[in-house]
Amino acid sequence: TVPPMVNVTRSEASEGNITVTCRASGFYPWNITLSWRQDGVSLSHDTQQWGDVLPDGNGTYQTWVATRICQGEEQRFTCYMEHSGNHSTHPVPS
């Protein structure tokens, strides 16, 4: 088992909103849970966009999940990752 590296980035979306993206890479096996949470609760599927789980060329995998949030509410959102029985949460950078 190889645990993922998780990286959270932000980009301007529209006025008052930002898109936050959580990327997981370098993990094996390919099964992974990656999702955005607001106040510790998973956002509904239709408010998130997921990338496919793809091989990254090193025998490991990568994927991502993104959502749009209101600027100023970043501290209420975390990326939740679960892989091979381990889990972690990752904040939005300020």
Epitope: D39, G40, L43, Q75, R76
Partner: antibody, heavy 119, light 108 residues
């Protein structure tokens, strides 16, 4: 001060419907997730439903899914629980609760409204 | 769904005694998503300990919480009369959210 006041409880026949309301005050209602939690007489707590601030993330307990609908009217600072196809096992005190930002958890509770399902 | 099992269901304690209750999850949960509530008869529950180990506002320092994975606990270092109540654990690691069945603490 944060205040949550439930209303709409009462006696309902099995198979009947009821709509509960929760009037919220003392905080910016449209920025907080909200829940309904119930407690049958002399029993423990049971989470019923969650709705986030923008009404775009909603979850239900398996015991009420398909029968209950949680909703909110942000301009009116009000939370609702529409209950249909009521059963005797739905008899309980229903609490409106505010979800704590960032950490989660039921940080504030109303006093509850009692729903009794009986013929 | 994640089942939370609390033990003991009932605890009779003397004043000044150390009291520990446990909450065991049916599958591993993040400590960020585990909370405890206190409820006294005829009253609404109160958030007591949040994210496993943080005391809610106004909670006496004799209370503490700990745990990880599937095993969590709440401890009262020295039991006082006002601590007699039922304590519930709660998780929102995964929907549906669930509560434990509660531990009722009484004065001996």
């Amino acid at each position: 001060d944060v205040h949550l006041v439930e209303s709409g409880g009462g006696l309902v026949q099995p198979g009947g419907s009821r709509k509960l309301s929760c009037a919220a005050s003392g905080f910016t209602f449209n920025t907080f997730g909200m829940n309904w939690v119930r407690q049958a007489p002399e029993k423990g707590l049971e989470w019923v439903a969650y709705i986030n601030s923008g009404s775009n993330t909603i979850y239900y307990a398996d015991t009420v899914k398909g029968r209950f609908t949680i909703s909110r009217d942000n301009p009116k600072n009000t939370l609702f629980l529409q209950m249909t196809s009521l059963r005797s096992e739905d008899t309980a005190m229903y609490y409106c609760t505010r979800w704590e930002p960032v950490t989660g958890g039921f940080s504030y509770w109303g006093q509850g409204t009692l729903v009794t399902v009986s013929a | 769904q994640i089942v939370l099992t609390q033990s003991p269901a009932f605890k009779s304690s003397s004043l000044g005694e150390r009291v520990t209750m446990t909450c065991t999850a049916s599958s591993s949960i993040s400590s960020s998503y585990l909370h405890w509530y206190q409820q006294k008869p005829g009253s609404s529950p109160k958030l007591w300990i949040y994210t496993t180990s943080n005391l809610a506002s106004g909670v006496p320092a004799r209370f503490s919480g700990s745990g990880s994975g599937t095993s969590y606990s709440l401890t009262i270092s020295t039991m006082e009369a006002e601590d007699a109540a039922t304590y519930y654990c709660h998780q929102h690691h995964r929907s549906p959210f669930t509560f434990g069945s509660g531990t009722k603490v009484e004065i001996k």
